[in-house]
Interface confidence: medium
Amino acid sequence: FERTRSLQDPCSNCPAGTFCDNNRNQICSPCPPNSFSSAGGQRTCDICRQCKGVFRTRKECSSTSNAECDCTPGFHCLGAGCSMCEQDCKQGQELTKKGCKDCCFGTFNDQKRGICRPWTNCSLDGKSVLVNGTKERDVVCGPSPADLSPGASSVTPPAPAREPGHSPQ
């Protein structure tokens, strides 16, 4: 079957890294500089991605694979194949149209990306606030007052954020 297909379409013999050159009697020609073909049998080579501006080259383009980009320090990738770079903020901030802004009271962000999220409302789980929240950290919920008997002092991890909690000042 392969032999039959090859007789019908000589381009099927062209391996990755080459293209089937119609201008040269369908000879397999190497991809020109700054281009690639990742599969065999291609009639053209694709232009290599250029990582410029805030994009850095993570992997150079080769004749058989495209370049891969990541983002310069201070930025992080978004989208499939790092199609965009978004600037980092500090912990305790979120990115807005006006750049990085501090989290509002009652919210936190413990990462350099993403949005500020409400503190856990410990009372929803019948617990009390053991450690107050900050712009960078969620509150830590402790046992409910009723649970505070001798020997019962384990701290439960914060529950998923549901609505703004209130941190006693």
Epitope: S83, C85, L95
Partner: nanobody, 123 residues
Framework: EVQLVESGGGLVQPGGSLRLSCAAS????????MTWFRQAPGGGLEWVAN????????YYVDSVEGRFTVSRDNAKNSLDLQMNSLRAEDTAVYYC????????????????WGQGTTVTVSS
């Protein structure tokens, strides 16, 4: 090909002015937020200013507020940055970038960048 090309950089004395331009091609310019960044020698990239699709919203980093003005001409596919009262600390390579607004729940990704134009403020 989607492209951004900056121009207008140069050497200027403290207190002087420069106007940077960014020519866009290969995409529908009026559909995108646009942003200016800069990179001082030996430093990281710093967001400077951005402008929404029709030019009605403009935002600036605190250090340039009142001195720099971002504008755009959608008919000419151009983005400008008017820089007045320049200071030594404004010395940097300035880049324009296309904003990738509308990507998922994160709205501030940049997907196309120019090659940069150098501004040197020195006496």
């Amino acid at each position: 090909e989607v492209q951004l090309v900056e121009s207008g950089g140069g050497l200027v004395q403290p207190g002087g002015s420069l106007r940077l331009s960014c020519a866009a091609s290969g995409f529908t310019f009026s559909n995108y937020w646009m942003t200016w960044f800069r990179q001082a020698p030996g430093g990281g990239l710093e967001w400077v200013a951005n402008i929404n699709q029709d030019g009605s919203e403009k935002y600036y980093v605190d250090s340039v507020e009142g001195r720099f003005t971002v504008s755009r001409d959608n008919a000419k596919n151009s983005l400008d940055l008017q820089m007045n009262s320049l200071r030594a600390e404004d010395t940097a390579v300035y880049y324009c970038a296309r904003g990738g607004l509308g990507y998922g729940d994160s709205h501030y990704g940049m997907d196309v960048w120019g090659q940069g134009t150098t501004v040197t403020v020195s006496s």
